[in-house]
Interface confidence: low
């Protein structure tokens, strides 16, 4: 007698978007409202991701890959997936405990998230100041006396700098 | 005998909003899912949303997201579809229907349908 | 412009076999075992002919049967009668975010 037949687990054949059900005999059965599933063979759907309050819905859930969320307008995403969100402050700004606070004479923000950037300081370059540095916007640093000369780049512009991991709004 | 009887037909006007309700009767209501399809003049189906009539769960075409709202009431054994911002274009047969058993594939009973005209 | 699409009309005389397609995608038709198939006489409600792709329910003639290939799953309707004159819809389970599809639907004459 035949003992070659496939002992293959009956699920394996359900495509993303189902489940297989237990309660009907192992069938699949397609995954329900607000639950996904975004690989085969899984014996339950995941529940979707609902972006509520500060989160707004970026791409809807599907029944095989799960909601994605950002903010509202006034906020800016943190974390992985856009786990967290946070509160916007105006250019010249950062967050803290208390909320959003001016940056400090000497540093700037150019951006609506992040903390205030001390200002470049042009004399370690040999280099001197030719605009003044703002809350919102770094110094420009100019050339030095030994940079007059025919030819040279009369304005070099500090490199910008920027947090790891953002993008300027 | 399953039944799912429906709403009297509704005219309304551009903006307003309409409610339509499906009420159940002939098993039991919690264990079947409930769709709505809706159907303009002349032309074929639409599928609207689910409701589990259990957990209240739903889930919205993406057409319709944010203008349709799906609820049930268990002790009516009714569930209700409101349609919000209505246009000319939702003029149409509004059907409830039966998941066959529980998130099954298809609808094995329908209602009778109920004609919401949108006229100014 | 329907998820699935379907011949607008087919017909045939009584006794001859018809079948209606219903082609869709790998997200739908192609992607689940969960096509339907709906009868609606004018001024009617739609009426379950044929689920997850080849079951009938209990009720319906045997004279109805389903079947699929790839994207595209199809209605057969064997020795047709006059009362078989009416619209039929496909409609499939999507792995999009709206989970259900229809067919355009196709108005089938009985000669």
């Known amino acids: 007698f035949e003992r070659t037949r496939s002992l293959q687990d009956p699920c394996s054949n359900c495509p993303a978007g189902t489940f297989c059900d237990n309660n009907r005999n192992q069938i699949c059965s397609p995954c329900p409202p607000n639950s996904f599933s975004s690989a085969g063979g899984q014996r339950t759907c995941d529940i979707c991701r609902q972006c509520k309050g500060v989160f707004r819905t970026r791409k809807e859930c599907s029944s095989t890959s799960n909601a994605e969320c950002d903010c509202t307008p006034g906020f800016h995403c943190l974390g992985a997936g856009c786990s967290m969100c946070e509160q916007d402050c105006k250019q010249g700004q950062e967050l803290t405990k208390k909320g959003c606070k001016d940056c400090c004479f000497g540093t700037f923000n150019d951006q609506k998230r992040g903390i205030c950037r001390p200002w470049t300081n042009c004399s370690l370059d040999g280099k001197s100041v030719l605009v003044n540095g703002t809350k919102e916007r770094d110094v420009v640093c100019g050339p030095s006396p030994a940079d007059l000369s025919p030819g040279a780049s009369s304005v070099t512009p500090p490199a910008p700098a920027r947090e790891p991991g953002h993008s300027p709004q | 005998e399953v039944q799912l009887v429906q709403s009297g037909a509704e005219v309304k006007k551009p903006g307003a909003s309409v409610k339509v309700s499906c009420k159940a009767s002939?098993?039991?209501?919690?264990?079947?899912?409930t769709h709505w399809v809706r159907q303009a003049p002349g032309q074929g189906l639409e599928w609207m949303g689910i409701i589990n009539p259990s957990g209240g769960s739903t889930s919205y075409a993406q057409k319709f997201q944010g203008r349709v709202t799906m609820t049930r009431d268990t002790s009516t054994s009714t569930v209700y579809m409101e349609l919000s911002s209505l246009r000319s274009e939702d003029t149409a047969v509004y059907y409830c229907a039966r998941g066959a058993p529980e998130y099954s594939s298809s609808s094995d009973y329908w209602g009778q349908g109920t004609m919401v005209t949108v006229s100014s | 412009q329907s998820a699935l699409t379907q011949p607008a009309s087919v017909s045939g005389s009584p006794g001859q076999s018809i079948t209606i397609s219903c082609t869709g995608t790998?997200?739908?038709?192609?992607?689940?075992?969960?096509v339907s198939w709906y009868q609606q006489h004018p001024g009617k409600a739609p009426k379950l002919m044929i689920y997850?792709?080849?079951n009938r329910p209990s009720g319906v003639s045997n004279r109805f049967s389903g079947s699929k290939s790839g994207n595209t799953a199809s209605l057969t309707i064997s020795g047709l009668q006059a009362e078989d004159e009416a619209d039929y819809y496909c409609?499939?389970?999507?792995?999009?975010?709206?989970?259900?599809?229809f067919g355009g639907g196709t108005k089938l004459t009985v000669l």
């Open positions: 409609s499939s389970y999507t792995s999009s975010s709206t989970r259900w599809v």
């Open positions: 790998s997200s739908d038709v192609g992607g689940y075992n969960y």
């Open positions: 997850d792709v080849s």
């Open positions: 002939g098993y039991t209501f919690t264990s079947y899912y």
